[in-house]
Interface confidence: low
């Protein structure tokens, strides 16, 4: 099996520039397409980019283009994602993982956190509106208390139809723990993933989706996210922390 | 060269299995996967599954989920393809071919096809 | 599953013209900026074998008569000039989601 082992945590000054490396051991990185997602406290995942492997192509968000780097080694099985002019906002954790063609992200690395230390600077400028065309992932409720055994169902919108053009939805579920990476789900609407319990499942179309634990058991209590890839820039919900009824 | 070696021809009875190699060679076998392809005499090409040697893996289509089974040796860079159940629709030349890095979802190296012929 | 129609079944064509093959997919098996669709030539008794990858590229040590065009659904393989190697049966095939598929073969006759 194919595991991505990233590189450790960093420390940086506003300004500065950071590299972070991703090797798959088990394998190589020849056949596979690379995207690198982040994190920052407290925010959604947020995709950046990815590298096609045949010929090191690469396609970044609007949001990180010019100030985000993409690129591979093929002979050392290595990705990596270089982060220039960084500011406080880029504190995150930055987690890079493959594209399966079924069109989700799986496995994913164990996640590298960056630090960008202000110094006590001034905060810098707002970023830049996105080109209008990003589809926004509003997840509800953002919290949800329940008991053991009881049924738990989260809702993702989105603000406009994931249906693909090639009549694919990718629109996809992943749980996320305590200090470990987003796992996998749910894939393409409804299809559970290997060895995700039968208590999960995924449904909906178009635009509205739902994610149902059918008796929720105590290593479900985590966060929730949905995420589309049906449109460029890929995007994720909010995310929905299940947590235990008091 | 790349080459991928398959037997000949294979003459099984109805009802049996038979199991059909595919040797690679002047590759690192396991960053390749394989895939294989059906032909029916004056048919065109119907694609079976895919293994990944590193890992196992597997993938089938749903219409030969319950006919074939794909397994490797990674000792001997050989690949298998076990057929089940045979009957005279099973009839055909069956494919081995690679997959992967610059022709990316493409199958580029084929091997030469082994002729299975169920009859009693 | 994709269903991948090609166009003629059967072509004739004298030597030193141009032959153009097309295949047309149910649906668009393009992603991200590259067409997952490719083509193979098939003699009898031979295995098939890759001319072009990725709608347009052509696989080393295929002459450059052959050509590939198109994107989305429509793509075309074009043999310009035609030699007489070149009789044979030709596949599309794309791997844009499995089941993956080839269409039904266009045999080309050289007159």
């Known amino acids: 099996q194919v595991q991505l082992v990233q590189s450790g945590a960093e420390l940086k000054k506003p300004g500065a520039s950071v590299k972070v490396s991703c090797k798959a051991s088990g394998n190589t990185l020849t056949n596979y397409v690379i995207h690198w997602v982040r994190q920052a406290p407290g925010q959604r995942l947020e995709w950046m980019g990815y590298i096609l492997p045949y010929n090191d192509l690469t396609k970044y968000s609007q949001k990180f283009q010019g100030r985000v780097t993409i690129t591979r080694d093929k002979s050392a099985s290595t990705a990596y994602m270089e982060l220039s002019s960084l500011r406080s906002e880029d504190t995150a954790v930055y987690y890079c993982t493959r594209w399966d063609w079924d069109g989700f992200f799986d496995p994913w690395g164990q996640g590298t956190t960056v630090t960008v230390s202000s110094g006590g600077g001034g905060s810098g400028g707002g970023g830049s509106g996105g080109g209008g065309s990003e589809i926004v992932m509003t997840q509800s409720p953002a919290t949800l208390s329940v008991s053991p055994g009881e049924r738990a169902s989260i809702s993702c919108r989105a603000s406009q139809s994931l249906v693909h053009s090639n009549g694919n939805t990718h629109l996809h579920w992943y749980q996320q723990r305590p200090g470990q990476a987003p796992r996998l789900l749910i894939y393409s609407v409804s299809n559970r993933f290997s060895e995700v319990p039968a208590r999960f499942s995924g449904s909906g179309s178009g635009t509205d989706f739902t994610l149902t634990i059918s008796s929720v058991e105590s290593e479900d209590f985590a966060v929730y996210y949905c995420s589309q890839t049906s449109h460029i820039p890929y995007t994720f919900g909010g995310g929905t922390k299940l947590e235990i009824k008091s | 060269q790349v080459q991928l070696q398959q037997p000949g021809a294979e003459l099984v009875k109805p009802g049996t299995s038979v199991k059909l190699s595919c040797k690679a060679s002047a590759y690192t076998f396991t960053n390749y996967w394989i895939h294989w392809v059906k032909q029916r005499p004056g048919q065109g090409l119907e694609w079976i599954g895919r293994?990944?040697?590193?890992?196992?893996?597997?993938k089938y289509n749903e219409k030969f989920k319950s006919k074939a089974s794909l397994t490797v040796d990674k000792p001997s860079s050989t690949a298998n393809m076990q057929l089940s159940s045979l009957t005279s629709e099973d009839s055909a030349v069956y494919y081995c071919t690679r997959w992967g890095d610059l022709h990316y979802y493409a199958m580029d190296y084929w091997g030469q096809g082994t002729s299975v012929t169920v009859s009693s | 599953d994709i269903v991948l129609t090609q166009s003629p079944a059967s072509l004739a064509v004298s030597l030193g013209q141009r032959a153009t093959i097309s295949c047309q997919a149910s649906?668009?098996?393009?992603?991200?900026?590259?067409?997952?669709m490719h083509w193979y030539q098939q003699k009898p008794g031979q295995p098939p074998k890759l001319l072009i990858y990725r709608a347009s590229n052509l696989d080393s040590g295929v002459p450059a008569r052959f050509s590939g065009s198109g994107s989305e659904s429509d793509f075309t393989l074009t043999i310009d000039p035609v030699e007489e190697d070149d009789a044979a049966v030709y596949y599309c095939?794309?791997?844009?989601?499995?089941?993956?598929?080839f269409g039904g073969g266009t045999k080309l006759e050289i007159k």
């Open positions: 095939m794309q791997s844009m989601e499995d089941p993956y598929t």
């Open positions: 649906e668009s098996v393009s992603f991200t900026g590259t067409s997952l």
């Open positions: 293994i990944d040697p590193n890992s196992g893996d597997t």
